[in-house]
């Protein structure tokens, strides 16, 4: 959010950018939470739109029997490791080819025992309110497929007829991590020191992170003719003065006619 400044007062404005705003030669460039000529105003709405995609990571171990372990496989930059990685990735891409959420594999460690492969299976899905169910189902299919392939592709008479062979008993799922999307938590974090006053409200299943100064929501504060402004002590109504009236009260709902004040009489609407 930016506000442009022209004229002699600009240099003066530069040193007065507030709340972490920076001067770009023309205006104060404000951080996400602020706006105004000097970044003095707090925004009333923060974009916490759900991420486009949600990811999951499965930590798996399989034992490859069709390759003899050598010390070079421990070195991730070695020719041996790079070749193993390429073949293993190609094999896993075949194994998981029917899973739309499958993104790829990432080898974390190779160790002795034939070749014990510690790796992550990476999954991703478009964000929908049902993302958790989608990823839970995908992780189940991953387990089924890896169990099946490590049972079927085995050494016979000490030789492998497949791209890779496995030890049936060496397949383990260690851990499954799904990226959590918590709009309330995101809203609180992004509102920083104003976190107590920002809330999440939903419209068409989409979350909105708003303060009471944002109009049109159930928590919206009605300041009547005044202006809602956020401060560290919460939302407050700044009441206006017109040519004919002063406005006061918590929601600027009390109007005092100027002519009556000058005539030493008070009149409330």
């Amino acid at each position: 959010r930016t506000t442009t400044c022209f004229g002699d007062g600009c240099q003066n404005t530069a040193s007065r950018c507030k709340n972490g705003g920076t001067w770009d030669g023309l205006k104060c460039q404000c951080p996400n939470l602020y706006y105004g000529e000097l970044c003095e105003e707090v925004v009333s709405s923060i974009d916490i739109g759900p991420p486009e995609t949600i990811s999951a990571q499965m930590e798996l171990t399989v034992t490859v029997t069709s390759v003899k372990f050598t010390e070079e496989l421990k070195n991730h930059s070695s020719q041996e490791f790079q070749e193993f990685k390429q073949t293993f990735t190609e094999q896993m891409n075949i194994v998981y080819s029917g899973i739309p959420e499958y993104v790829g594999v990432n080898i974390t460690k190779l160790r002795l025992g034939s070749v014990v492969v510690e790796h992550d299976v990476l999954l991703r899905t478009k964000y929908t309110p049902e993302y958790k169910t989608v990823l839970d189902n995908a992780t189940e299919v991953v387990k089924e497929k890896i169990t099946k392939v490590t049972t079927q592709q085995i050494m016979i008479n000490d030789i492998c007829s497949d791209m890779m062979c496995f030890n049936t008993t060496g397949t383990q799922v260690q851990n499954i991590t799904v990226t959590q999307y918590d709009p309330e938590e995101d809203c609180r974090k992004m509102a920083k020191e104003y976190g107590d006053y920002f809330v999440v409200e939903y419209r068409d299943q989409k979350p909105y992170c708003i303060s009471p100064c944002e109009p049109g929501f159930s928590v919206s504060k009605n300041c009547n003719l005044g202006k809602c402004q956020m401060s560290l002590s919460g939302p407050q109504c700044l009441c206006v003065t017109t040519e004919t009236h002063w406005y006061s009260g918590e929601t600027c709902n009390q109007g005092t006619q100027k002519s009556l004040v000058y005539g030493h009489h008070h009149h409330h609407h």
Epitope: T65, S66, V67, K68, T70, E72, S78, Q79, E80, E83, F84, Q86, T87, E90, M155, D158, I159, C160, S161, D162, M163, M164, C165
Partner: nanobody, 124 residues
């Protein structure tokens, strides 16, 4: 990158002999796997034999046992296939394959590096 160049193919009569060679370059280690595969017209590529260059393992397909011998010269980084008692069914394009891993698989998809192939024809 690993480069493989085969030589020694040709036409030979049944019962005759040939020696195929495959010169390898580009390895960072002196311990790796090399293999001979062959592909007859209209058939899938199949393993003939493989060897670990550290001498740890050799393997032969049942159809060539006792007639074909695989060997490797570490000093020359060259793979050989000594072919004796050749038969008409040995006619194929012979490919040299290699891997920086110590492989125990006869599936061609596991072998990343390949030569261009050399033709062996056994005919009277």
């Amino acid at each position: 990158d690993v480069q493989l160049v085969e030589s020694g193919g040709g036409v030979v009569q049944p019962g005759g002999s040939l020696r195929l060679s495959c010169a390898a370059s580009g390895y960072t280690s002196n311990r790796y796997s090399m293999a001979w595969f062959r592909q007859a017209p209209g058939k899938e590529r199949e393993v003939v034999a493989f060897i670990w260059t550290d001498g740890g393992r050799t393997y032969y397909a049942d159809s060539v046992k006792g007639r074909l011998t695989i060997s490797h010269d570490n000093a020359k980084n060259t793979l050989y296939l000594q072919m004796n008692s050749l038969r008409a069914e040995d006619t194929a394009v012979y490919y040299c394959a290699a891997s920086s891993l110590l492989l125990q698989t006869i599936n061609p998809r596991a072998w990343p590096y390949w030569g261009q192939g050399t033709m062996v024809t056994v005919s009277s």
